[in-house]
Interface confidence: low
């Protein structure tokens, strides 16, 4: 169970990262090739970028989280894969105050992307009303990031 | 579609303890926080427990607290709820729901009498 | 614990009206710039059914003819042109905090 507390501090921390830095038994039982990554990724970024616009637009005056704080990328020249089982217990958290739909659409993306023999830790949101907001908002912003790196890695490796 | 199976209602007596269990299916029910509601006969609908999608977190109103558990078997799709210390007020229909997350409850199954009486 | 106070308790009006029930909660159930209240449909005999989601959300399969608004404390469930089979009990429900609360219920009838 991962606790809440400073949610822009660690908000995804596990969010991106190497497939091939992982051990072996958390490794995918199937290895999606970077076509099939790419395809996700391009599934998931207006999701994305969405849900953070009408957030943002709802939440004006919301300091903005710390993209830098993301170990989204690592210096590997291997194919970056995002963790889809460390993304997914945010996105379930975050679920009953963001568009139902559109966050459906993503899980079931990243469902894709989740490492089947990793067991899937549980986040619950702030109960603070204005670090709830943060936690959204930290969750939207660097998953956001998040993709666009992972895309801009994709796009500038072979295809 | 999505289908919530409730069983275990039954007569029982004041200081009584019951089981209610729900199977669902069509859906991914390890995805989803689940709920129980009841009616009393008649009355309106009261909100008696929740548990979120992996079982880490429940919530009960005070009313309940300390005398009902929600549970949940993420395995066999089945949510239970251990009642005990059963009082006559506690005689509901109770539901089986689908909560959205911690938030909506979007589909709800037939429900199950549990009465409890001397 | 945030009370809700559903009005009218019971309506009767006539095919093609527009009804309108409203809920107000005790405080503010709005957060991030969402009511997070919710309308739920009960037919005689039947299970209740979720019509609109968070203020104003449509749930898939329900009429348009149905359609939620409202913020902060006041909301209000509305039939724009009402029919026969919309005889029900209507249910206001907050998720804003714990417990999770209901109004006492609208009685619909159809005249």
């Known amino acids: 169970m991962l606790s809440h507390a400073g949610p822009a501090r660690f908000a995804l921390f596990l969010l991106c990262c190497m497939e091939t830095l992982l051990p072996s038994h958390m490794a995918p039982t199937h290895r999606l090739q970077p076509s099939d990554v790419r395809k996700i990724i391009l599934e998931l970024r207006p999701m994305s970028k969405g849900l953070l616009q009408d957030y943002v637009s709802k939440e004006i005056g919301l300091p903005e989280s710390n993209h830098s704080s993301l170990p989204c990328l690592s210096s590997d020249s291997q194919l970056p894969h995002i963790n889809g089982s460390a993304i997914l217990p945010y996105f379930r958290a975050i679920r009953p105050l963001s568009d139902k739909n559109t966050i459906d659409k993503i899980i079931e993306q990243l469902d894709k992307l989740k490492f089947q023999r990793e067991p899937e830790a549980e986040v619950s949101m702030p109960a603070d009303n204005f670090e709830r907001k943060n936690f959204i908002l930290a969750v939207l912003q660097q998953f956001s990031a998040c993709l666009e790196h992972v895309l801009q890695s994709l796009n500038s490796g072979p295809q | 579609d999505v289908q919530l199976v409730e069983s275990g209602g039954d007569l029982v007596k004041p200081g009584g303890s019951l089981r209610l269990t729900c199977v669902a299916s069509g859906f991914t029910y390890s995805n989803y926080g689940m709920s129980w509601v009841r009616q009393a006969p008649g009355k309106g609908l009261q909100w008696v427990a929740t548990?979120?999608?992996?079982?880490?977190?429940?919530y009960y109103p005070d009313n309940i607290k300390g005398r009902f558990t929600i549970s949940r078997d993420n395995a066999k799709n089945t949510l239970y709820l251990q009642m005990n210390s059963l009082k006559t007020e506690d005689t509901a229909t109770y539901y089986c729901?689908?909560?959205?997350?911690?938030?909506?409850?979007?589909?709800w199954g037939q429900g199950t009498l549990v009465t409890v009486s001397s | 614990e945030i009370q809700m106070t559903q009005s009218p308790s019971s309506l009767s009006a006539s095919p093609g009206d527009r009804v309108t029930i409203t809920c107000k909660a005790s405080q503010s159930v709005s957060f991030a710039g969402t009511g997070l209240m919710h309308w739920y449909q009960q037919k005689p005999g039947k299970v209740p059914k979720l019509l609109i989601y968070?203020?104003?959300n449509l749930e898939a399969g329900v009429p348009s003819r149905f359609s939620g608004s409202g913020s902060g404390t006041d909301f209000t469930l509305t039939i724009s042109s009402l029919e026969p089979e919309d005889a029900a009990t209507y249910y206001c429900?907050?998720?804003?905090?714990?417990?999770?609360?209901f109004g006492q219920g609208t009685k619909l009838e159809i005249k």
């Open positions: 429900q907050q998720s804003r905090e714990y417990p999770w609360t």
């Open positions: 548990i979120s999608y992996g079982g880490s977190y429940t």
């Open positions: 968070r203020a104003s």
């Open positions: 729901v689908r909560g959205y997350g911690y938030d909506t409850m979007d589909y």
